[in-house]
């Protein structure tokens, strides 16, 4: 098969809703950089669908996505990350929709990863630490984390803290005694760059103490 | 209407310093990619700096390396070039630039620098 | 770093067509977009031509931009020539950051 739609198709296509979302990560494998975008309409007939990305590259004028199941994607070295590029969706060699968009206002950090929890009893608090692959990162270096607590029983009773170092205290008054809590962190870029928030983190859980009726403290 | 205004050029000294400022209206300044050329008397265009939207990205042209600085205020809509260290070769018209979609859509009018003792 | 080089000047009579060449040194034409600028004395540069062969909005559909792989050159092309095109024009193409300059020609319509 060619790629190239009948002309019925592309009367029919050009009715469909061909609107898309991408965002890129930065240095995401050592100096290469990735762009992923889909489709916000998941019933959208991909078959003879690509996408290319033109304009605010190295040493090439257009690249063309790879298309992975329902997402397309580009990993390289080749975007200037200066200036505006054009995103299209094609048929062939016929553009169904474009946007023009700069990859350094789209970004989604990678999902902070090694979340723990230590109880210190001596200061009767919970030190919450976590760790980013950004730190080592030349472009994308700032971000604000959120940082998403909840008592396991209380399904979305979550309690969020803000925060741009990769530490956090929480107070052992502040939590329930005797409980188990969930934890999680996400990022997003706080400084130059603009985007989305990342993935979750994978949960962390940790009891509290009980209370030690002596002191009213927990044990 | 889409206007640059560039101001702060002048007469200056070998060694001296000057900085020029690039005032914007008209277009959303703050994802414009900016640029500083520069043209000689009787000459072609060189290519000096460019920033981008967010300051982040700033580029030379080995001339002026070291020696001038670029920078923006997007609250401000204004565009800068600090230049130090100044040259009899540096005398030029300074135009500012906006990229936009394709480089070089909207020129100011230019400030003419002079270095001379 | 390549160069672009662009032939001095040109002179063609009013109503004829025209054509500057503008050849890249080093490195492929193709792997960065070309742009065309109009100077005119005294004035500022316009962008005539974008993205190799787009013309911007108010810009006459006389002029037109094309790439030659096999030169490894861009060219602006003026048809029906006007006493208004007599001006400098300058290409101007992408070294990774840095843009890059043609020496830029001078068109006289006689």
């Known amino acids: 098969e060619s790629g190239y739609a009948q002309n019925g198709d592309l009367e029919d296509a050009e009715l469909d809703d061909y609107s898309f979302s991408c965002y890129s990560q930065l240095e995401v494998n050592g100096s290469q950089h990735s762009l992923t975008c889909a489709f916000e309409d998941p019933d959208v007939n991909i078959t003879n669908l690509e996408f290319e990305i033109c304009g605010a590259l190295v040493e090439v004028k257009c690249l063309n996505f790879r298309k992975l199941q329902e997402i397309y994607f580009i990993e390289t070295k080749k975007f200037l990350l200066i200036g505006k590029s054009n995103i299209c969706v094609k048929v062939g060699e016929k553009s169904l929709t474009c946007k023009k968009i700069d990859l350094t206002t789209i970004v989604k950090p990678e999902a902070p990863f090694d979340l723990s929890v230590v109880y210190r009893e001596g200061a009767n608090d919970f030190v919450v630490t976590f760790n980013t692959s950004h730190l080592q990162k030349k472009y994308v270096k700032v971000l604000m984390h959120d940082v998403a607590y909840r008592q396991e029983k209380d399904e979305n009773k979550w309690t969020h803290v803000n925060l741009s170092s990769t530490k956090l205290t929480l107070l052992q008054r502040k939590l329930q005694p005797a409980a188990m809590y969930e934890i999680k962190v996400r990022s997003i870029p706080d400084h130059y760059f603009k985007g989305f928030w990342s993935e979750w983190s994978p949960s962390y859980y940790f009891r509290t103490p009980e209370i030690n009726n002596s002191s009213g403290e927990m044990d | 209407e889409v206007q640059l205004v560039e101001s702060g050029g002048g007469l200056v000294k070998p060694g001296g310093s000057l900085r020029l400022s690039c005032a914007a209206s008209g277009f959303t300044f703050d994802d414009s990619v900016m640029h500083w050329v520069r043209q000689a008397p009787g000459k072609g265009l060189e290519w000096v700096s460019l920033v981008g939207w967010d300051g982040f990205f700033t580029y030379y042209a080995d001339s002026v390396k070291g020696r001038f600085t670029i920078s923006r205020d997007n609250a401000k809509n204004s565009l800068y070039l600090q230049m130090n260290s100044l040259r009899a070769e540096d005398t030029a018209v300074y135009y500012c630039a906006r990229q936009g979609d394709y480089m070089g859509n909207n020129w100011g009018q230019g400030t003419l620098v002079t270095v001379s003792s | 770093n390549f160069m672009l080089t662009q032939p001095h000047s040109v002179s063609e009579s009013p109503g004829k067509t025209v054509t500057i060449s503008c050849t890249r040194s080093?490195?492929?034409?193709?792997?960065?977009?070309v742009q065309w600028y109009q100077q005119r004395p005294g004035s500022s540069p316009t962008t005539v031509i974008y993205e190799d062969d787009q013309r911007p909005s108010g810009v006459p559909d006389r002029f037109s931009g094309s790439i030659d792989s096999s030169s490894n050159s861009a060219s602006l092309t003026i048809s029906g020539l006007k006493t208004e095109d007599e001006a400098d024009y300058y290409c101007q193409s992408y070294d990774f950051h840095h843009l890059v300059f043609g020496g830029g020609t001078k068109l006289t319509v006689l």
């Open positions: 080093s490195g492929s034409i193709d792997s960065s977009y």
